[in-house]
């Protein structure tokens, strides 16, 4: 194998889901001493940054001031130390939201259920889309895909207290262009005390934020960015 440097981490701040016309920063964390970072968009060269002084910087930021559907897609970054290049980062799926319309999210049999009950979410949008996404707010930002002409079903099956939390849905016009988010639906699952203590709710964000859950330690940051990297990478699989 030709020697290559370890792949950098890539993530978006405040989030990989960006409302149209809002700003987003794509961050790429490589190694101290890297003399050049490149941001690639869908395989094309998007931007180059040559940090100064390189030995004191291990992260660069690429700023997008005005998100739109042309900027939505798959990003990766790569860096160089001397003549040696890194492997490209994992792919970051940058999604533009608040496109066109707002779906309606409902839950059956209702938002308050008992552990073990079967629960189904319904996401409805009357405009031209056939793919829907259900997200549970929280650090791991679970995403489920569903299909239907105007409505998609998301059966959760028999729920446990781990399913508690706030859900929203989106209509998707293509992989990287989503509708406005639905109004949130908070699912409350009651169960016995043992179950509750064993399955705490994911930490959720304030209702008005979709920001990443950033930790303050460097290792924490790396782990968390890797987690978001992974979430974004698997969003569209």
């Amino acid at each position: 194998q030709q020697q290559t440097l370890p792949k950098p981490f890539i993530w978006a701040e405040p989030h990989f889901m960006v409302p149209k016309e809002k700003q987003v920063t794509i961050c790429c964390q490589g190694n101290y001493g890297a003399v050049e970072y490149q941001l690639h968009f869908e395989g094309s060269l998007f931007a180059v940054d040559r940090p100064k002084p390189p030995e004191r910087i291990n992260k660069v930021q690429f700023y997008i001031p005005d998100m739109n559907s042309r900027m939505a897609g798959q990003y990766s970054c790569i860096y160089r130390v001397g003549e040696l290049w890194s492997e490209p980062s994992n792919l970051l799926d940058l999604v533009v939201t608040e496109m066109y319309d707002t779906p309606t999210l409902s839950v059956h049999p209702g938002p308050e259920v008992i552990s073990g009950e079967k629960v189904t979410f319904y996401c409805r949008l009357d405009t031209a889309t056939s793919m829907f996404l259900l997200l549970k707010e929280g650090r791991s930002s679970h995403v489920q895909r569903g299909y239907g002409k105007v409505q998609a079903e998301f059966p959760l099956g028999p729920v446990t207290t781990a399913h508690r939390g706030t859900y929203r849905c989106f209509g998707s016009y293509n992989n990287h262009a989503w509708s406005f988010p639905s109004e949130p639906v908070k699912l409350l699952v009651t169960g016995d005390i043992e179950n509750t203590s064993l399955a705490p709710e994911d930490p959720t964000f304030p209702a008005d934020t979709w920001g990443t859950y950033l930790l303050t330690t460097e290792t924490g940051l790396q782990k968390d960015h890797a987690l978001w990297d992974h979430t974004a990478q698997n969003l569209l699989r």
Partner: antibody, heavy 116, light 106 residues
Framework: QVQLQQSGDDLVKPGASVKLSCKAS????????INWIKQRPGQGLEWIGR????????YYNEIFKGKAILTVDSYSNTAYIQLRSVSSEDSAVYFC?????????WGQGITLTVSS | QIVLSQSPAILSASPGEKVTMACRAS?????IHWYQQRPGSSPKPWIY???SLASGVPARFSGSGSGTSYSLTISRVEAEDAATYYC?????????FGGGTKLEMK
């Protein structure tokens, strides 16, 4: 070490289809985009399209849509270009190139000759 | 699409001379890349992202420019530099190449 090994030169009849290959070795195949480039005898370089082996996602130069199909086989670390219904206009050398910090590794090229 | 025009088409130089070749884009591009190609060989990456030298390229080569106007300069030409040089952009679809400048030795 990194290598892109392209299949041998080919002679095909007009109207036929042909599939040319580019076998990668020495790196993580799925992480890097592969571009295909055409060069007619004595002429310049023309970009055909690109593919990312991780997902098979492709982009084409509009003028090659319907003519070229780019595919990958991640098990054998091989990228392919299929040219449909070839004519003398398709007689050229075809290169594959990997995208790192630049188009850092190129195949040696395949000379395709279209002749009856 | 972005059309890249290279000039001159043919450049004759004597060893030790300084030479410059130009690449003009039909609309603004952020980066231009250069390749060297000798007959019967694959293009070799030469200069990338306007001014960075690819691995193994001698320091007598340099690249510069911005917007629609870019250039490749050889400070002191050597016989081994005889080849065709292509400029390219790969930031905007479809990616495009210039028609090439052939550098010949006098």
């Amino acid at each position: 070490q990194v290598q892109l090994q392209q299949s041998g030169d080919d002679l095909v009849k007009p109207g036929a289809s042909v599939k040319l290959s580019c076998k990668a070795s020495g790196y993580t195949f799925t992480s890097y985009w592969i571009n295909w480039i055409k060069q007619r005898p004595g002429q310049g370089l023309e970009w055909i399209g690109r593919v990312v082996p991780g997902s098979g996602r492709t982009y084409y130069n509009e003028i090659f849509k319907g003519k070229a199909i780019l595919t990958v086989d991640s098990y054998s670390n091989t990228a392919y270009i299929q040219l449909r219904s070839v004519s003398s206009e398709d007689s050229a050398v075809y290169f594959c190139a990997r995208v790192g910090g630049y188009w850092d590794y190129w195949g040696q090229g395949i000379t395709l000759t279209v002749s009856s | 699409q972005i059309v890249l025009s290279q000039s001159p088409a043919i450049l004759s130089a004597s060893p030790g001379e300084k030479v410059t070749m130009a690449c003009r884009a039909s609309s603004s591009v952020n980066y231009i890349h250069w390749y060297q190609q000798r007959p019967g060989s694959s293009p070799k990456p030469w200069i990338y992202a306007t001014s960075s030298l690819a691995s193994g390229v001698p320091a007598r080569f340099s690249g510069s420019g911005s917007g629609t106007s870019y250039s490749l300069t050889i400070s002191r030409v050597e016989a081994e530099d005889a080849a065709t040089y292509y400029c390219q952009q790969w930031s905007s679809n479809p990616y495009t190449f210039g028609g090439g400048t052939k550098l010949e030795m006098k």
